[in-house]
Each structure stands twice: as structure tokens, then as C-alpha cells.
């Protein structure tokens, strides 16, 4: 054995998205001597770990290791042994960390640098984890599905059918949606980017794009629900709240403490006289929509046009990919259908929230009922957000393409995130100079 | 031919340091995880950890027992794996070898001569 | 930490003999399980990898089978240089770990 066994002719990559309310662990794969081709890197495995998000195990970081341990030991089944010290390991943390490290920096370290330690005792060429920006995640994920849609390539694509096929290079936009924040990214229409922070420059094969991104902490599902509860027990006349984007009937009891355990509800935090309230749900779509509206601040715009609380967001522009929670939400309510109009999404999910929670239950008895619960409100919070929130109209939202994967690799930042950090996207045609990453930090 | 040379054994008291060497030659050095083991007299194998390359940071992992008192480190211009050994006991009276694994991982397919520590008052 | 557990300590054969070493591993390893031969003031020589791989100038009568929890190395026939001390070797998971050691002896 005195000969280093002869690397395979693909290369693989490991990416762990360290999101808010869980961790996947996605397994890439590309031919070795195509590595600056555009569309030849391929998801070849998806892992989700069981258990929270890793801004949870604050108070328990000794359980990281075993936490990771499943998916860890997945991956090196999946790649063959003789790859696994070449194959690069990254861990990016979003929103849920980016929270934390709000709280407290040091709370943030500890989780990060457990995970740190935890994922270098496996083979691989492990680079690091760390808490990646809400600009990051946005441009990441543009990148992903434009590479995957064949949008940066000049010469025919390497799969047979494209899907959204546009018949031209124009890119698709982004939109994002998490547990704790929500990113929305496209190229606008010869628009100046008023707002610097929002403005991304990038140059891929030879081109040359200017991109808006911008990322709403606090505004994924599972935040804005508690945004949402935090808002609206403050005018509750008693531990009693009555809530339209709960099934009828549907029960149950949250902790004040809970409510205010994250940043994302200071904003509405008072002293209230009682330590636990119990929501009960009465199913009213338009009630819920208006709602979820007194969470944008639509008030106050320093820019030609905002999208809410502040935010310039120039003219919506093209196609648009609508993935991660956008896309399960709207798959589970069987609402992804190109054909589907949001007028009749709106009377859909009308129709949804108003079924009784009893019904539901048995409708979907094999769904968690702890999810079940929530996708009347994250259904329209979706509608919410994209007509309301970044001003889809219902002649636009056929321009709304709900995607979970594309030729069998996940819409997410994770690809994107990993192309750049192993220099996989030139910035010229092959064979020239690869980006750096730091034209993204 | 590939070759693992250890040196820097020797007679130690308790609570001292000691810095071992390992020169390699014949293979890549810089390509490859380098690891430690000893061997306490008429006993078994004991595995004392590992340094990983440029790429993974120089990324070391040790065992509990030596954990906090020895210090991995190489020198790839050099072709030498280091191991620098301090507040040492009695029970870290071994043979030291310098090992590797030219094909694949975590097991041993190179070996050094060994070279003995004794650490004795 | 993984334990490998090795029976007999020791084993008694003659030449010609067929030799079954064991090792147990506290939890699965799947086949990260390395075997090793090792003769008094030399350094171990590596035998098998991965439970059943053999290695080239190493002679074939030397096999090794397993995985999971339960290995085994065996000798075919017994020649006069194999009598030495083998050692087994967890290389699923850090801290890598070895057995204890069986020592084959001429009977």
C-alpha cells in the first residue's frame, strides 16, 4: 500500500446548512476535469439530522457531536473511501445562529466552535463552520439556481430538459424563505441599487451582473409566527388568544417566556400578567392576512420604493425561484402548480384555514402535528410577503416559480456557497481566473 | 525507498519535557497525516494522536492521556514531524513511533524504528 | 472511545496449524478494523486492512474477515516467522484505538 490509491475521476463536497430549526448535510458531486464547466456539479445526497437547529444546543453543547453523528457517518458511506480526505467539508450557519450571536456573542462561539471540533474528528478536509451573512445566503442562492438553470452557460447545457425554460440567459430571481429570516435576490432592469448595503457585483463566465439582495432577519416563518403571537397578545384581554391563522378548535398553550426568549419579539415585549397564554385557533384566512400586514412597516420609505421596514427593493424584474420554506409550504398545500393563479391560491387557502382542526388532523394524520398546525399561517404569510411585502401583483405571480430541487440538486444557498469556495465559478470562460470569496464577504 | 527516522529519546525526569523527531523521506511528506504511537514496555500499542495538512489547518487530535501536555507539529520545508512532550510521568515510558498511511486513513502502513523515552527520577 | 477486545491473550499452535484470532469492538466499526503483526525490538507491520483487504508482499495465507463488532484474523497454516504478537485496530473513529494484543506462541 505505498502508492496513494488512485483518486476517482469525480470529486465530491460536503456542505451542512446550519438553519434555524434544523441542520441537512448536502453531498455534491463533479467530474474532476470539468470543474469550471458550468451545470456539471450535481447534489448526489441530502441528510437532514434529527433534532433542532444548532442555535439550540446553546445550553448543551456537549450533545453536538452525537447530534452530527448520523448524517457525518451518511457521508462517508456515500463517498468512497479513498475521497474522503480530499473532499472538502463546510458548515454555514444562518439565521437561527445569527440570532443567537445577537444575544450573545460568546453563546455563539461556544455552539460554533463545538460543531468546529465535532465535524474535524471525521476524514475529510473539514474548512470550518461559521455564521454566514443574510447577503451571503441571498447571492448564494441566486447563484445555485442560475447554475443549476443553465443561466451562466454560453453552450448547450449538459442535462436534455431545462424546467422554467425562459429560452434565453436572462437569470432567474431568488426568493428564499427560512425558519428566521427570508432573502429576496434578482438582477433589476437597468435600476440603480440605491442602497449600497443591498448591492452585489459579480463577474461569472465572462459577464457581468449587478444584483440586489437583501435579507429580512426575523422574517422567516417560524420568526415572524412569533412576531405575529408577541404582537397580538399585547392587546389580549386575558390569557385567551383568539387567532385567525389557526384552525377551528385547534388548542394550545405557549409560555410567555418562550414568546420572549427571542430578539425578534423585543419589539412587542410587555409585562404581561400571566406566565402562559393559550392560543385558540378560529380559521379566518383575511383576519390572519391582516394580521401578518402589521408586521411590515410600510410606512417609511427613504428610497424611490421599499419593500417594508425601511428597505429599498427596486422594481421586480423576470422569473423568479421560490425555494426552501416558499416551496415546501406551498408543495404541501399543493399550491406550486405553474397554472395556479394567486387569485385562486387566495381562495384556496381561505378554504384551508376555515377546515376545522379536527378535520385536518385526520386529513393528514401522518403529518407532525406540531407543522400541521402552523401551515395556515405560513401559507399566508407566504402570500403576505410576496404580494405585500415585495409587491407581486397578481399579473406578476405567474413569474413566481415555486422550485424544491432542479435536475435533482435543492434550491438553496448550499451549492452556491460551495461552488465559490472551491473556486468552481470563473469569473471568465473557462479556463481563466476563478472568483475569489471575497468578492462576496 | 520510503523511510520514517525517529530521534530525541532519552532519559527524563518527571514533570519534564522532551521533543521527539521523525524525518521522512521517499514520499510526499507534505501530502500526508502524520501520526504518533508508543509502546510502554511489555505492553501494547497506544495510539497518541495525529497532525493533518497545510489544507486542513494543521488540524491535531490527541489522546486523553496525553491530552493538554504533548504538542504535535511538522515542518513539510523539512520533511519532519514533531512531537514535543511535556510535563511527563512515569507512564509515558515507551517506545515512540513515527507512523503514516500512504493509502487511505487511520491505519498504519509506515512505521519508524522507535525511539525510547524514559521518564524516571 | 471505541474498545477493541482481543481473545485468546494468548495461543498456542504448532507449525502447519491453522491460527483464528479475534477482536471485538464495543460498538459497530463497520469494517474500519485493521490487523497488524508485531516480533520482540521491531516495530508492527501492517497485515490487513479494512477487516479483509491483504497487502501486497504480505503472503496469503493471512485472511481477514469481519464487520460490525466481530473480526477475525486467521493463518491457514502456521510457518516459524509467524509466531509473534497481533494486534487489531479501530480506524472507524478518533481516538483510533488498539486491542490488547494476542500472542501466538509455539506449542
Known amino acids: 500500500t505505498q502508492n496513494k490509491a488512485l483518486p476517482e475521476n469525480v470529486k465530491y463536497g460536503i456542505v451542512l446548512d446550519a438553519g434555524s430549526s434544523h441542520t441537512s448535510l448536502y453531498i455534491y458531486k463533479w467530474p474532476a476535469e470539468k470543474e469550471n464547466d458550468t451545470g456539471v456539479v450535481h447534489q448526489v445526497e441530502e441528510c437532514r439530522v434529527k433534532g433542532p437547529g444548532i442555535s439550540k444546543f446553546v445550553q448543551k453543547v456537549n450533545e453536538i457531536g452525537i447530534y452530527l453523528t448520523d448524517c457525518m457517518e451518511r457521508a462517508r458511506e456515500v463517498i468512497p473511501r479513498s475521497q474522503h480526505q480530499e473532499t472538502p467539508v463546510y458548515l454555514g450557519a444562518t439565521a437561527g445562529m445569527r440570532l443567537l450571536r445577537m444575544e450573545s456573542e460568546e453563546l455563539a462561539d461556544r455552539v460554533l466552535d463545538v460543531v468546529e471540533r465535532s465535524l474535524s474528528n471525521y476524514p475529510f478536509d473539514f474548512q470550518g463552520a461559521r455564521i454566514i451573512t443574510g447577503q451571503e445566503e441571498g447571492a448564494y442562492g441566486w447563484i445555485t439556481i442560475n447554475y443549476l438553470l443553465g443561466k451562466f452557460s454560453q453552450k448547450t447545457r449538459w442535462f436534455s430538459i431545462v424546467p422554467y425554460e425562459t429560452n434565453n440567459q436572462e437569470t432567474f430571481g431568488a426568493l428564499d424563505l427560512g425558519g428566521a429570516s427570508t432573502q429576496v435576490t434578482f438582477v433589476p432592469q437597468n435600476q440603480t441599487i440605491e442602497s449600497p448595503d443591498n448591492a452585489l457585483q459579480f463577474r461569472l463566465y465572462g459577464k457581468d451582473y449587478n444584483v440586489y439582495t437583501h435579507s429580512f432577519l426575523c422574517y422567516g416563518k417560524d420568526q415572524a409566527l412569533w412576531q405575529k403571537l408577541a404582537k397580538d397578545i399585547q392587546v389580549a384581554s386575558n390569557e385567551i388568544l383568539r387567532d385567525p391563522c389557526f384552525h377551528p378548535g385547534y388548542k394550545k398553550v405557549v409560555n410567555v417566556s418562550d414568546l420572549y426568549k427571542t430578539p425578534c419579539t423585543k419589539r412587542f415585549e410587555m409585562t404581561l400578567p400571566f406566565q402562559q397564554f393559550e392560543i385558540q385557533g378560529i380559521g379566518n384566512y383575511q383576519q390572519c392576512h391582516q394580521s401578518i400586514l402589521e408586521l411590515f412597516n410600510t410606512s417609511y420609505c427613504p428610497y424611490s420604493q421599499c419593500a417594508f421596514n425601511g428597505i429599498f427593493l427596486p422594481p421586480l424584474q423576470g422569473d423568479f425561484g421560490a425555494f426552501s420554506a416558499f416551496y415546501f409550504v406551498m408543495k404541501f398545500l399543493n399550491l406550486t402548480s405553474e397554472k395556479v393563479s394567486q387569485e385562486k391560491v387566495t381562495e384556496m387557502m381561505k378554504k384551508f384555514c376555515a377546515q376545522p382542526w379536527e378535520e385536518i388532523k385526520t386529513s393528514y394524520a401522518g403529518v407532525k402535528e406540531k407543522y400541521l398546525s402552523e401551515y395556515c399561517f405560513s401559507g399566508t404569510y407566504i402570500l403576505s410577503l410576496l404580494l405585500q411585502g415585495y409587491h407581486f401583483t397578481a399579473d406578476s405571480w405567474e413569474h413566481i416559480h415555486f422550485i424544491g430541487k432542479i435536475q435533482g440538486s435543492d434550491a438553496g444557498w448550499t451549492l452556491g456557497y460551495m461552488l465559490n469556495l472551491t473556486n468552481m465559478i470563473p469569473a471568465e470562460q473557462p479556463l481563466s481566473t476563478p472568483l475569489s470569496h471575497s468578492t462576496y464577504v | 525507498e520510503v523511510q520514517l527516522v525517529e530521534s530525541g529519546g532519552g532519559l527524563v525526569k518527571p514533570g519534564g519535557s522532551l521533543r521527539l523527531s521523525c524525518a521522512a523521506s521517499?514520499?510526499?511528506?507534505?501530502?500526508?497525516?502524520m501520526n504518533w504511537v508508543r509502546q510502554a514496555p511489555g505492553k501494547g500499542l497506544e495510539w497518541v494522536g495525529e497532525?493533518?495538512?497545510?489544507?486542513?489547518?494543521?488540524?491535531?487530535h490527541y489522546a486523553e492521556s496525553v491530552k493538554g501536555r504533548f504538542t504535535i507539529s511538522r515542518d513539510d520545508s523539512k520533511n519532519t514531524l514533531y512531537l514535543q512532550m511535556n510535563s511527563l510521568k512515569t507512564e509515558d515510558t515507551a517506545v515512540y513511533y513515527c507512523t503514516t498511511q500512504l493509502d487511505l486513513y487511520w491505519f498504519f502502513d509506515v512505521w519508524g524504528q522507535g525511539t525510547t523515552v524514559t521518564v524516571s527520577s | 472511545e471505541i474498545v477493541l477486545t482481543q481473545s485468546p491473550a494468548t495461543l498456542s499452535l504448532s507449525p502447519g496449524e491453522r491460527a483464528t484470532l479475534s477482536c471485538r469492538a464495543s460498538?459497530?466499526?463497520?469494517?474500519?478494523l485493521h490487523w497488524y503483526q508485531q516480533k520482540p525490538g521491531q516495530a508492527p507491520r501492517l497485515l490487513i486492512y479494512?477487516?479483509?483487504q491483504s497487502i501486497s508482499g504480505i503472503p496469503a495465507r493471512f485472511s481477514g474477515s469481519g464487520s460490525g463488532t466481530d473480526f477475525t484474523l486467521t493463518i491457514s497454516s502456521l510457518e516459524p516467522e509467524d509466531f509473534a504478537v497481533y494486534y487489531c485496530?479501530?480506524?472507524?473513529?478518533?481516538?483510533?484505538?488498539f486491542g490488547g494484543g494476542t500472542k501466538l506462541e509455539i506449542k
Open positions: 479494512y477487516a479483509s
Open positions: 485496530q479501530n480506524g472507524h473513529s478518533l481516538p483510533l484505538t
Open positions: 460498538q459497530s466499526i463497520s469494517d474500519y
Open positions: 521517499g514520499f510526499t511528506f507534505s501530502k500526508y497525516w
Open positions: 497532525i493533518r495538512l497545510k489544507s486542513n489547518k494543521y488540524g491535531t
